[in-house]
């Protein structure tokens, strides 16, 4: 069973079949004579009641208002009211791209590894039995494949299959052809296996500090997903109040892997934190790798060669 | 546009446990719900578990109810399934959706997905 439309802000396509359906349909067939109502509220217009008459595009069913499609003029505030429930949508129907058979906006994309098995499926179960045909476009070319039903491809990825797939329903309703396009962009990329992690800079960082004032180490890492980098300090870790772990913030890499830093910030430099070792840990399932921070006295920097400071 | 990135799959023994990761990018991660399809060789395409990117709110098959958890963390656009307890019916390829509309009815198994496997 489908589930009900429950994003309350939805974009949709111009010229397309288009549906909401309220959350309370279990609810409404149990109260089968309680008054249920559907509102439309745009610009100067307030709550206007939706029936079939309002216009020849709209149909209710149950718990469903269809469009027969969307059109631009549909863009607005679409409540469904039965009892004390009350279900609110703000609906943006926006242009379709005349020079494509797809509105980019609406495109979902992934990327497959180059010989790695995938796969592409046109499936819309809500208008499965109004469908009579559908049809998988590449790049807006229509592939010629066997089942006209439910279009499917199956195969190990070539970097010649990168391209813009479009799912294309075609259905008849009231004995006009519609039609409902899903594409999903596929980007074949060279085999991502995983990388050694490995931290960035020097493995040994002397940082000038002035007592009674803070510093923040920074510690950076080229790693895969499910590695972790973390902070060792001290003969336990979170002994002293002054040292805080910041939250690690991670950016994927074109490549897929993930370019991660976690900042230990120091408040308060005492006498305490002089010349003992932060250590920073990336850790894989394929080893580790630590790097290292001493904070030195600015007054003491004269006894340590130039090439060894960080800021 | 929203692209969608899986990992977390692997080889285990029935009983274990493995958590799917799924990583949304190139749009605000709230325009969407995310979820969880999978697929078992020569079956049909099963949506198992999704999860509301504004209330938390969660759906979950009858069939992993109770073993599966889905989470989200919103400062890394990234929702977790975490499977715990897994059995060999659970062996197939996941694949990550996002869906603007919350009614989870256009497809879902498309792209390489990540291969679990049990094993008993």
């Known amino acids: 069973a489908e589930s009900c439309t429950s994003r309350p802000h939805i974009t949709v396509v111009e010229g397309e079949p288009f549906y909401l359906k309220h959350c309370s349909c279990s609810l409404a067939h149990e109260i089968e004579t309680t008054t249920k109502s559907w509102y439309k509220s745009s610009g100067s217009q307030e709550h206007v009641e939706l029936n079939p008459r309002s216009s020849s595009r709209i149909a209710l069913h149950d718990c469903v208002l269809e469009f027969w499609p969307v059109e631009l003029n549909d863009t607005g505030s679409y409540f469904f009211q039965m009892k004390n429930y009350t279900q609110k949508w703000k609906l943006n129907v926006i242009r379709r791209n005349k020079h494509s058979c797809f509105t980019e906006r609406q495109v979902t994309s992934k990327i497959v590894e180059v010989k790695k098995f995938f796969q592409i499926t046109c499936e819309n179960s809500y208008y499965q039995t109004l469908v009579n045909s559908t049809s998988l476009y590449k790049n807006c070319k229509k592939l010629l494949l066997e089942n006209n039903k439910n279009p499917t491809i199956k195969k190990n990825a070539e970097f010649e299959d990168q391209g813009y797939y479009s799912c294309v329903h075609f259905l008849h309703h009231n004995g006009k052809l519609f039609n409902i396009t899903k594409t999903f962009n596929i980007t074949i990329v060279e085999d991502r296996s995983n990388i050694v992690p490995v931290l960035l800079g020097p493995k040994l960082n002397h940082v000038a500090v002035e007592l009674g004032k803070n510093v923040r180490l920074n510690c950076s890492a080229l790693l895969n997903e499910e590695d972790v980098i973390y902070w060792m300090f001290g003969e336990e870790n979170g002994s002293d109040p002054n040292i805080h772990e910041e939250k690690e913030m991670r950016i994927m890499t074109p490549e897929g892997k993930w370019h991660a830093s976690k900042v230990l910030r120091i408040e308060n430099i005492g006498e305490s934190n002089l010349n003992v070792l932060y250590n920073c840990t990336v850790a894989s399932t394929g080893g580790t790798d630590t790097k290292s921070f001493i904070l030195v006295r600015k007054a003491d920097m004269a006894d340590i060669p130039g090439h060894v400071f960080t800021r | 546009q929203v692209q969608l990135q899986e990992s977390g799959g692997g080889s285990v023994q029935a009983g274990e446990t493995l958590r799917l990761s799924c990583t949304a990018s190139?749009?605000?991660?709230?325009?969407?719900?995310m979820g969880w399809y999978r697929q078992a060789p020569g079956n049909k395409c099963e949506l198992v578990s999704t999860?509301?990117?504004?209330?938390?709110?969660?759906y979950y098959a009858d069939s992993v109810k109770g073993r599966f958890t889905i989470s989200q963390d919103n400062t890394k656009n990234t929702v977790y399934l975490q499977m715990n307890s897994l059995k060999p019916e659970d062996t197939g390829v996941y694949y990550c959706?996002?869906?603007?509309?919350?009614?989870?009815?256009?497809?879902?198994?498309w792209g390489q997905g990540t291969q679990v496997t049990v094993s008993s």
């Open positions: 190139g749009s605000t991660f709230d325009e969407y719900d």
């Open positions: 999860i509301s990117t504004i209330d938390g709110s969660t």
């Open positions: 959706e996002a869906d603007d509309r919350g009614t989870w009815d256009r497809g879902g198994c």
